[in-house]
Amino acid sequence: ADLGSMGYFELQLSALRNVNGELLSGACCDGDGRTTRAGGCGRDECDTYVRVCLKEYQAKVTPTGPCSYGYGATPVLGGNSFYLPPAGAAGDRARARSRTGGHQDPGLVVIPFQFAWPRSFTLIVEAWDWDNDTTPDEELLIERVSHAGMINPEDRWKSLHFSGHVAHLELQIRVRCDENYYSATCNKFCRPRNDFFGHYTCDQYGNKACMDGWMGKECKEAVCKQGCNLLHGGCTVPGECRCSYGWQGKFCDECVPYPGCVHGSCVEPWHCDCETNWGGLLCDKDLNYCGSHHPCVNGGTCINAEPDQYLCACPDGYLGKNCERAEHACASNPCANGGSCHEVPSGFECHCPSGWNGPTCALDIDEEFGLVPRGSGHHHHHH
């Protein structure tokens, strides 16, 4: 399965010294039958390459068995002894190249892993003599060394030195999480993105860091306009405030009242809660007709009745819907100077004799105006 990797175990061989140019068996690399104890191996140097086996932690290392964490090998690196550039920037570049299938430093072995890095491991490093005519077998083994330990993912290299039976090896190792993988076990995934599946970058720990305008665990939720009432409004893109049905206003904090509501408002949508002194389904019925219209005259007391209705309680001597009519208006003889009193629906009228005028015939025309009265001189007074 093409899974990609969560991380890499990297081994950079720095030096190998096999001063006698011999195999672990004691034979010479050139295979002429002589051994070092029979006069040394001078004619032909070893063609040394390295094989690396990575497996689970073993307190007592067994060189056989599967390389459960991975396996790698170098090309032929040199003869009996050689030195390679130390791991560092070159190794980093090589690792990047190796992931894209390009040329890499010959002494670098990169073993990708697709599981949570367990931190503890066993490393078995073998130096072999390359022989074109044979497949690798124990006869061509120069040296086998092993290391069981713990390593956490980091950029720094850890140096290891081995003095084996015939060879001395110096190497550096490290574990690095792949791009988009984080944590001490390289199993925390975070890949920056800016689409409907999330709008985020990743911090150094692999946590999603929401881009401006986005929030939530996956940074999929838009941050609405500041002040937007999220109980009654929301947004799918940042900076907006879209109201739920029944709500309105810039911040979706105003309910929509019942259509046609006149003197009322709402706390819940589609309600029409009447203002003081208003009633009816649309709050269009005046419950305080008295206070807003003052219809009673002549000292009448106004009493609110049904919506838009009222009653006038009239004082003695007055009647009518608004107490506008005087009862027995002529009983008090209001007309002076011989005027005659006549009751009319609106009160009384004084019919004044010649020379007098006014509502109660109290005005002397000659004194007031210096004029002779015109007409009959009668006057209607509406009391």
């Epitope: 409907f196 599946f197 893109v237």
Partner: antibody
Framework: EVQLVESGGGLVQPGGSLRLSCAAS????????IHWVRQAPGKGLEWVGG????????DYANSVKGRFTISADTSKNTAYLQMNSLRAEDTAVYYC????????????????WGQGTLVTVSS | DIQMTQSPSSLSASVGDRVTITCRAS??????VAWYQQKPGKAPKLLIY???FLYSGVPSRFSGSGSGTDFTLTISSLQPEDFATYYC?????????FGQGTKVEIK
């Protein structure tokens, strides 16, 4: 060569269940999203849901939420669409599609699609 | 959900014509719009992503433009293999939504 192959479609009764598979090859499965898009006969395209196989994050269209479940098996490079409580309106050709994404671009595109598998919900 | 409204729903054109299809989003979707081509009985094919970027292998006669709410797909010189249905899709906010499609037919 990038390939997506759907399977598992067929005729099912209303209320029944079906599981569609989307076998992926030719690319690193965990580096992309896999989405399911359907197309009712003679109609347009409708997104059903998607998954990010690397972390299992999923999302669904409101019309299928609670009825459909998307999962992925990274060891098999396969995404699944488990469809329960099927309705007549779920009848469609179901496509799986690979969705690439890059933080340098706002939005993304579904760059590879399977051939589609027909699901018919009828009694 | 964000609505994507395509226009026209269909058009007739001749080989060599310049064809323009528009897509309007109900809300701002930045540049998160992709365009697809679909032929009968086949899966859709990606043409344009992020509003204006031509997908690898797509002929340069196809181009996309726009941001915010208004987007355009242009075919500079229509070829016989371009007769198909075209869909826009926003991928800015969940759920991603498609336009209803524009069918390009031979005049």
């Amino acid at each position: 060569e990038v390939q997506l192959v759907e399977s598992g479609g067929g005729l099912v009764q209303p209320g029944g269940s079906l599981r569609l598979s989307c076998a992926a090859s030719g690319f690193t499965f965990t580096s992309y999203d896999i989405h399911w898009v359907r197309q009712a006969p003679g109609k347009g395209l409708e997104w059903v849901g998607g998954i990010s196989p690397a972390d299992g994050d999923t999302d669904y269209a409101n019309s299928v939420k609670g009825r459909f479940t998307i999962s992925a098996d990274t060891s098999k490079n396969t995404a699944y669409l488990q469809m329960n409580s099927l309705r007549a309106e779920d009848t469609a050709v179901y496509y799986c599609a690979r969705n690439d994404y890059d933080v340098r671009f706002v939005g993304s595109g579904m760059d590879y699609w399977g051939q589609g598998t027909l699901v018919t919900v009828s009694s | 959900d964000i609505q994507m409204t395509q226009s026209p729903s269909s058009l007739s054109a001749s080989v060599g014509d310049r064809v323009t299809i528009t897509c309007r989003a109900s809300q701002d979707v930045s540049t998160a719009v992709a365009w697809y081509q679909q032929k009968p009985g086949k899966a859709p094919k990606l043409l344009i992503y992020s509003a204006s970027f031509l997908y690898s292998g797509v002929p340069s006669r196809f181009s996309g433009s726009g941001s915010g709410t208004d987007f355009t797909l242009t075919i500079s010189s229509l070829q016989p293999e371009d007769f198909a249905t075209y869909y826009c899709q926003q991928s800015f906010t969940a759920p991603p939504t498609f336009g209803q499609g524009t069918k390009v037919e031979i005049k």
